[in-house]
């Protein structure tokens, strides 16, 4: 009686179970009464990453420099190429098909996490006691100057965008 289900790494065709092709190889002929499944290795710049019955290998991803991409990890017959972005850019999606410049944190905000090739800058508002007066992709919020430690007093209060202004203490005669 012909099988209705096959073992792992097999597939059902013409009422018989045939072996799947291993990762890195494509199917060129189903098994027959007289022969096993016939598979051939994927060509240069092609891959298949699972046990399969694909008749064509997938093309490796192209990391297009015109889109700001570069190769992070070269593909093999069993894995796709992994792209990342050039310095100063990050991927627009998880699949990293294009790149955009890193975001700068505006005055009043500091860098919480510096951008990588795959993630954008994460900014945070400067909390009380801290400020940022620049638009930057690297600068964190800086603490207000401590006037006391310089034997000075606050003449102008700080904000999230400006430092405090220190001045000499009023001498009472």
């Amino acid at each position: 009686e012909p099988p209705t289900a096959c073992r792992e790494k097999q597939y059902l065709i013409n009422s018989q179970c045939c072996s799947l092709c291993q990762p890195g190889q494509k199917l060129v002929s189903d098994c027959t009464e007289f022969t096993e499944t016939e598979c051939l290795p994927c060509g240069e710049s092609e891959f298949l990453d699972t046990w399969n019955r694909e008749t064509r290998c997938h093309q490796h991803k192209y990391c297009d420099p015109n889109l700001g991409l570069r190769v992070q990890q070269k593909g093999t017959s069993e894995t796709d190429t992994i792209c990342t972005c050039e310095e100063g850019l990050h991927c627009t999606s998880e699949s990293c098909e294009s790149c955009v410049p890193h975001r700068s944190c505006l005055p009043g905000f500091g860098v919480k996490q510096i951008a990588t090739g795959v993630s954008d800058t994460i900014c945070e508002p400067c909390p009380v006691g801290f400020f940022s007066n620049v638009s930057s992709a690297f600068e964190k919020c800086r603490p207000w100057t401590s006037c006391e430690t310089k034997d000075l007093v606050v003449q102008q209060a700080g904000t999230n965008k400006t430092d405090v202004v220190c001045g000499p203490q009023d001498r009472q005669r």
Partner: antibody, heavy 114, light 112 residues
Framework: QVQLQESGPGLVKPSETLSLTCTVS????????VHWIRQPPGKGLEWIGV???????NYNPSLKSRVTISKDNSKNQVFLKLSSVTAADTAVYYC????????WGQGTLVTVSS | DIQMTQSPSSLSASVGDRVTITCRSS???????????LQWYQQKPGKAPGLLIY???NRFSGVPSRFSGSGSGTDFTLTISSLQPEDFATYYC?????????FGQGTKVEIK
């Protein structure tokens, strides 16, 4: 039913290219492979190679540098070319449908001689 | 390549004799699927080979029951239980487990 018929010149000069055609019926070239096998007079059988349904090929490593197998699906024909032939390539050449090992062509004798 | 070695290369026998031909491969013919792709062919002068046995022991349709195949791994046998006049021919073993496919050198069965 499945049938295969080999054809081509029976005499080829040394150093020239041997060219044979296998015309098939009863099965479809876009879905099935075709093998070439040869047999020198009074000797054993030697697998030459195969062209698969999608056009990919496998060749016997001992002949790989000289052999090309191609096909024309629309004409139901498979072609064998063997370059730089010598007397050692004198043989009966058979074609065979993959999965139809019970059905061989009748074979065609090719003699390499000047 | 896998070498297929047949023995004997020729033998003389009489009608009614039991004939055994052996075939040894240089490496195992067991595929990772568990199947063993070992065929036996019969060839008569001026004719193409005809399939007798496939996958070691399966008789092809229309092949008389006097032909049987056995063996495993690297050692295989074709047995003709009672030789008939039409069985005088050359017999080849063949493996299709590994590319390139290879054949034994043949065993010629002649009339004694």
């Amino acid at each position: 039913q499945v049938q295969l018929q080999e054809s081509g010149p029976g005499l080829v000069k040394p150093s020239e290219t041997l060219s044979l055609t296998c015309t098939v019926s009863g099965f479809s070239l876009p879905t099935s492979g075709v093998h070439w096998i040869r047999q020198p007079p009074g000797k054993g059988l030697e697998w030459i190679g195969v062209i698969w349904a999608g056009g990919d090929t496998n060749y016997n490593p001992s002949l790989k540098s000289r052999v090309t197998i191609s096909k024309d699906n629309s004409k139901n024909q498979v072609f064998l070319k063997l370059s730089s032939v010598t007397a050692a390539d004198t043989a009966v050449y058979y074609c065979l449908g993959h999965g139809h090992f019970d059905v061989w062509g009748q074979g065609t004798l090719v003699t390499v001689s000047s | 390549d896998i070498q297929m070695t047949q023995s004997p290369s020729s033998l003389s026998a009489s009608v009614g004799d039991r004939v055994t031909i052996t075939c040894r491969s240089s490496q195992s013919l067991v595929h990772s699927s568990g199947n063993t792709y070992l065929q036996w062919y019969q060839q008569k002068p001026g004719k193409a080979p005809g399939l007798l046995i496939y996958k070691v022991s399966n008789r092809f349709s229309g092949v008389p029951s006097r032909f049987s195949g056995s063996g495993s791994g690297t050692d295989f046998t074709l047995t003709i239980s009672s030789l008939q006049p039409e069985d005088f021919a050359t017999y080849y073993c063949s493996q299709t487990t590994h590319v390139p496919w290879t054949f034994g050198q043949g065993t010629k069965v002649e009339i004694k």
